[in-house]
């Protein structure tokens, strides 16, 4: 069935959430395989995902070494089967990815409300400090550990009986808000990095309402 040419990868796209980072590309290979290389601007090109027929490569282990660095990846197309290499002088075809700076670009994952506790007319709402795959001294860092005060949370809260939302902000993982006595409230939070120009906000957390399991109610 005749020879075909190797095809360069295209649509190289970084998919990254809370630093879990995967490079995706097209096309699905026919009689070819791919090897990915990743580098910082000043570093060596390191091969990963050798001779794969996948069209994605998990590069998390590389980018978490320094999330503030800017990375570039490239995808090589290698003939595998009844094909001819179209690279010059036996050099394989490759395509470069866009640059990627994890600290500035990784998507913020959907946060989770860990708990809420009412004491009189005050409610303390705690956001789960999600673990990332970034390591320091052999332990995984949380989102707060990585972003510090660059990361804030916005709390949306409203009376169960009405639709009017109020907001609060914190640069920790806790909110302390005033509520009306005898009213049940619902809560949702969103992670935000105000200094960013892209991917500034996460999706909203699942809604949690008072009178359900997560909360604790104490009338003082």
């Amino acid at each position: 069935s005749g020879t075909t040419n190797t095809v360069a990868a295209y649509n190289l796209t970084w998919k990254s959430t809370n630093f879990k980072t995967i490079l995706e590309w097209e096309p699905k290979p026919v009689n070819q395989v791919y090897t990915v290389q990743i580098s910082t601007k000043s570093g060596d090109w390191k091969s990963k995902c050798f001779y794969t027929t996948d069209t994605e490569c998990d590069l998390t282990d590389e980018i978490v070494k320094d999330v503030k660095q800017t990375y570039l990846a490239r995808v090589f197309s290698y003939p595998a089967g009844n094909v001819e290499s179209t690279g010059s002088a036996g050099e394989p075809l490759y395509e470069n990815s866009p640059e990627f700076t994890p600290y500035l670009e990784t998507n913020l994952g959907q946060p989770t409300i860990q708990s809420f506790e009412q004491v009189g007319t005050k409610v303390n709402v705690t956001v789960e400090d999600e673990r990332t795959l970034v390591r320091r001294n052999n332990t995984f860092l949380s989102l707060r550990d990585v972003f510090g005060k660059d990361l804030i949370y916005t709390l949306y809260y409203w009376k169960s009986s009405s639709s009017g939302k109020k907001t609060a902000k914190t640069n920790t993982n806790e909110f302390l808000i005033d509520v009306d006595k005898g009213e049940n409230y619902c809560f949702s939070v969103q992670a935000v990095i105000p200094s960013r120009t892209v991917n500034r906000k996460s999706t909203d957390s699942p809604v949690e309402c008072m009178g359900q399991e997560k909360g604790e109610f104490r009338e003082i």
């Epitope: 395989v33 060596d44 090109w45 390191k46 091969s47 290698y78 036996g90 394989p92």
Partner: antibody
Framework: EVQLVQSGAEVKKPGESLKISCKGS????????MNWVKQMPGKGLEWMGM????????RLNQKFKDKATLSVDKSISTAYLQWSSLKASDTAMYYC??????????WGQGTTVTVSS | EIVLTQSPATLSLSPGERATLSCSAS?????MNWYQQKPGQSPRIWIY???NLASGVPARFSGSGSGTDFTLTISSLEPEDFAVYYC?????????FGGGTKVEIK
């Protein structure tokens, strides 16, 4: 010119330790994974694993996980294969080979290791 | 791990004859290399990516196959072709070699 030069033949007793070397020259040593391949006398080839010199990440064949250790010294462009306690079954020719695509193919000349009491 | 089985273990042929070497994988492989090794020498890449001839390899050699069955063919043996040939898969870790086929002079 790319060259991989391996250390000389070794004769050891069971239980002894050993470190053999593979020095790369003529290319950016830290940019290429380095493979190690074992060949027992009169037998076939076995892929032991490979190491990336820039950060020492290793991919090891589980068969050799508790038997051999891969390391590098970037400052002298040298990869190492070592054993803490040799066995008779470690008697073999050991090759280092730069991980390359396609026609690029660079192997060391091999190091003969003989383990005998 | 993927086990590669080469057959026959030894192939006794005369110069000018056709040689067919087989490599069978225990599960599907997408990237297969073949190496040639002569006595006292390091292995040399011979065919890469299933069917691509390495630099300097004569056109009488060819490689083919897909999935679990791969073949190295020498259309007409020359004296310098007598050697051991190994297949190697690089589709999944650990990378593995076949046991080799020795092509010897009959």
């Amino acid at each position: 010119e790319v060259q991989l030069v391996q250390s000389g033949a070794e004769v050891k007793k069971p239980g002894e330790s050993l470190k053999i070397s593979c020095k790369g020259s003529g290319y950016s040593f830290t940019s290429y994974w380095m493979n190690w391949v074992k060949q027992m006398p009169g037998k076939g080839l076995e892929w032991m694993g490979m190491i990336y010199p820039a950060d020492s990440e290793t991919r090891l064949n589980q068969k050799f996980k508790d038997k051999a250790t891969l390391s590098v010294d970037k400052s002298i462009s040298t990869a190492y294969l070592q054993w803490s306690s040799l066995k008779a079954s470690d008697t073999a020719m050991y090759y280092c080979a730069r991980e390359d695509y396609g026609s690029s193919d660079y192997w060391g000349q091999g190091t003969t290791v003989t383990v005998s009491s | 791990e993927i086990v590669l089985t080469q057959s026959p273990a030894t192939l006794s042929l005369s110069p000018g004859e056709r040689a067919t070497l087989s490599c069978s994988a225990s599960s599907s492989v997408s990237y297969m290399n073949w190496y040639q090794q002569k006595p006292g020498q390091s292995p040399r890449i011979w065919i890469y990516g299933i069917s691509n001839l390495a630099s300097g390899v004569p056109a009488r050699f060819s490689g083919s196959g897909s999935g679990t069955d791969f073949t190295l063919t020498i259309s007409s043996l020359e004296p310098e072709d007598f050697a051991v040939y190994y297949c190697q898969q690089k589709s999944s870790f650990p990378w593995t070699f076949g046991g080799g086929t020795k092509v010897e002079i009959k």
